[in-house]
Structures are given as structure tokens and as C-alpha cells.
Amino acid sequence: SSSPTSSASSFSSSAPFLASAVSAQPPLPDQCPALCECSEAARTVKCVNRNLTEVPTDLPAYVRNLFLTGNQLAVLPAGAFARRPPLAELAALNLSGSRLDEVRAGAFEHLPSLRQLDLSHNPLADLSPFAFSGSNASVSAPSPLVELILNHIVPPEDERQNRSFEGMVVAALLAGRALQGLRRLELASNHFLYLPRDVLAQLPSLRHLDLSNNSLVSLTYVSFRNLTHLESLHLEDNALKVLHNGTLAELQGLPHIRVFLDNNPWVCDCHMADMVTWLKETEVVQGKDRLTCAYPEKMRNRVLLELNSADLDCDPILPPSLQTS
């Protein structure tokens, strides 16, 4: 697997003081920041659950895997990880659950080997469009990121600054076309109501996309056509009612795709006929025998694969004069 090792042997701990002391000199090769644990053998630094309010300045140059989880960082400024000499080997950075509410433009600049970034479980009210691209150029230098984990980054309703959260996240994903090499993108548990139509077309290298546990109602305007390499598409626990012909055809045309659709409130009326026919024939959907109707009431808990065209009717629409209030 590509994930960094989350436990490493032979850690050394530094003295628990001067948590955010600024060092003018480059750190010594074996130096370990205060409140952190370091293993040079495993090239891993862990500063976990220490209530740090900023990124330690004296990170050792050897660090490949950096865990800064469970802290109180609040803001990641531009160049938050820029060092002299640079952290040239840093490949995996985990900032989950560190109370980040703002990630500024260029926060991850000067990390030439950064392949994996996890910002999950932070209430990101302000994610700069240039957080990942580092510049406002129309085409930025390619980001080295291959895996971007953004699960549960939605802030509380009252902190959303009166703008589309989906739009803010997508702007950061698309800025400068910097993330063309991204292969894993996780956006689970973010209350997404929709997926902006252009987002996937500009992430052509995706192999794994996780949109589970959102509030997606429809995929009608989302195109999967360019995602030749997509292998897993997680859409469990959304608000999907039906998948229409265009979407079904696009998914079927992806050579390696596996789609996960459990726990959606499927509406089993006449509009579902094409999807049921497709489900019976396709190998694309994992666990398709578990998919059940949620509506209408008379169809609740019926297994989609067991339905036939006679089951899928639409009540006639009454003219307004005959409708009851």
C-alpha cells in the first residue's frame, strides 16, 4: 500500500518545552522538535495530540512521514513547511484533527516530494484556491501530490462565510491545473449537495474517488468520461434517487471501475427502469444485491435486482384542477 507507516520504532522524544521556538540555525540532523517523537530509522516524526498551535520550525531534514494530528493549529500560513534546507524528503503529511480553519495560498510550497496529504477532520472555513497550487497562475507548476484526503473538512453551518463550500473545495482542487497527477481523492462526509460539473474532467489520473456520506442527490451533470484509470468510486450514504442513462453508460465505459452505491434512498418508480436493467447486467457495481428501494412507500425495502418493469410505475400526474391541497 502507499500509505505511510503510522507506527515507527526507536522514537526519541525531546524535552517538553519551547514548543514553538524559532531556530535561526538549520536544525541538527538528529534534532527532534519539542513535544514530538522522532525516528530517524523510520524517517518519521510524530507530534500527536500535543495542542501545538503552529508547525514546529525545527523539523529534522530527514523526515519522510510527518504526523501533526490532534493539535490546535488554526491557520496554515504560506510556506508553513518551508525550511532551509527544504524538507526535500517529506512524502506523507497528516494534519488531521488539528482544528485548522484556514489554509492559505502556498501553505504546502517547498515540499517537492509531498505525495500524500491528509487534512481530514478540520473545519476548513477558509481553504484558499491556491492552497495546493501555490500560485494564482492559470497553469501552475504540477503539484507532486498523488493522494489527497479531505474527509470531514466541512465547517459548522455558521462558519461557512456565506459561500458554497463545494465551490471553495473545488476551486482549490482545480487551481492552476496543479493536481493533474492526483490518483486518490477522498471527500467523504462533507455535506456536499452537488459536484460541480468540471471537477472530474480536470483530474484525469484519478484511480480512487471517495464521495461517500455526502448529500449528493444527482449525478446528472457530472461526467466520468475522461477518468480512464478510475478504479473505485464510493458513493455510499448519499441522497441519490436514481442514476440516469448517460451516467450509466459512462460508468460502464470505464474499463476498471467499481462503484459502491449502498445506503442511498433509491426511488423505485418509472424513472428507475433503465438503472434496474443496467444493474442486472453490469459487473461495475459492488454489492448490487444489497441495493433497496426507499420510495415510494409501497416499494420500501424491495431489492432493486428483483424488480421488473411492471413494478416500476409512475402515478399519473393529475391536472391542477384535480389535485388536492
Partner: antibody, heavy 116, light 113 residues
Amino acid sequence: SVEESGGGLVQPGGSLRLSCAASGFSLSSYWMSWVRQAPGKGLEWIGIIAGRGSTYYASWAKGRFTISRDNSKNTLYLQMNSLRAEDTAVYYCARVSSIYYTFNLWGQGTLVTVSS
Amino acid sequence: AQVLTQSPSSLSASVGDRVTITCQSSQSVYSNNELSWYQQKPGKAPKLLIYYASTLASGVPSRFSGSGSGTDFTLTISSLQPEDFATYYCQGSYYSGSGWYYAFGGGTKVEIK
């Protein structure tokens, strides 16, 4: 881990099916590949099966070699037909990383000898 | 078909030496980065050292490093250790409209001088 089996002595023109049993992970969630190595020679890629079952082969292997798998048995197979002396080799199965296109888990290999 | 040319095919070196092995592809590997390096000892399966051209696999000592992009790649051992005497292979991944193709270099045998 992965473990190959089914190797042995086979006559030229004969057929053989190799197995690769996976444990600790679900075979259907990964791309899996077969690689061989003739005695004293280098590694040679045979082919690969994707998570959903698509297969791709080296040009020399097309037609004679077939990769398949049985998800219920968590086992990968390599069917080899019309075997020749030059197919004598150690055959390895290898798992492909879920993100990168690299072989990150190898079996110990099984020796196939084609001889009359 | 894609061809990976490794050089040298063999080399003799001493403990502590810096060793460089090159791998040239007849066409660009997928995403310019999908080049891996493996170490193999006699009678053993290959072991992944480096993937994505320059990323060290878990548990691999930092004296190993990889570089390059597109068609030209290098494996460097900064200070050769006794356990490093082995054969090294590069492996590239390729994608075209007709699908995936993988190829190995011919190998470089690192022997004790």
C-alpha cells in the same frame, strides 16, 4: 502474503496451470501480475489482471498464456499452453500497489521445467 | 514494445563505494514517474526498493535513492554495504489506448571487488 503453486516438469507442447493463493488481503481489490525468470536470466513480465478482471499481456504471451482469478477462493491463476523449452523459469505472482503501478508484494515463486 | 535498457549489466565495487545504475526507456513511462527499482538476491524473490522514480519503499535504507523522469532514470547507493551485493532491476509501467504494459530492465549485478 502470496504463495505460488503448481509448478513442475511438463513436456513440450503440454499445458500447466499455476495458482497463486493470497492471504491477508482480498485479491479482487488489487491488480495482480505474473512475472517469470529463466535460470540465470532477468525478470520478464507476463501479464496483469485488473481489479474488475480486465487482462493485459506482454506481446509474446498473448494467445498462449491466460490470467484469471477466483475471488471466492482468493486465488490467481496462470494457464500456460503449448509450452516450449524456453518457458522453463521460476514463475512469480506479484501484487500491484493500489496507487502506484509497482509490484509491492511478491511470492517466492514456483519452478516450471519444460523438457522431454 | 517498450524496452528498458539498464547499464552497466554488471559492476564490481567495494564496501563504502558510491554506486550508480542507469535505466533508459524507449518511451516515456506512465506519468513520467512510474519507474520502480527492485533488488534480488540468489534464490529469492525480488524486493521493491524504490517506486514512483524516487520514493523509497517502506523499510528500505536511505542510502538508496532514485531520480529521473520520462525516459532516463538512476538508482544510487550512496555507500555500499555488504548486504547490498545483489542484482538490481528497473521496471517501467506504460499506458496506451490499448491498455497497460509493463517491462523490466535486463538487470545489473553488483559484485564484490
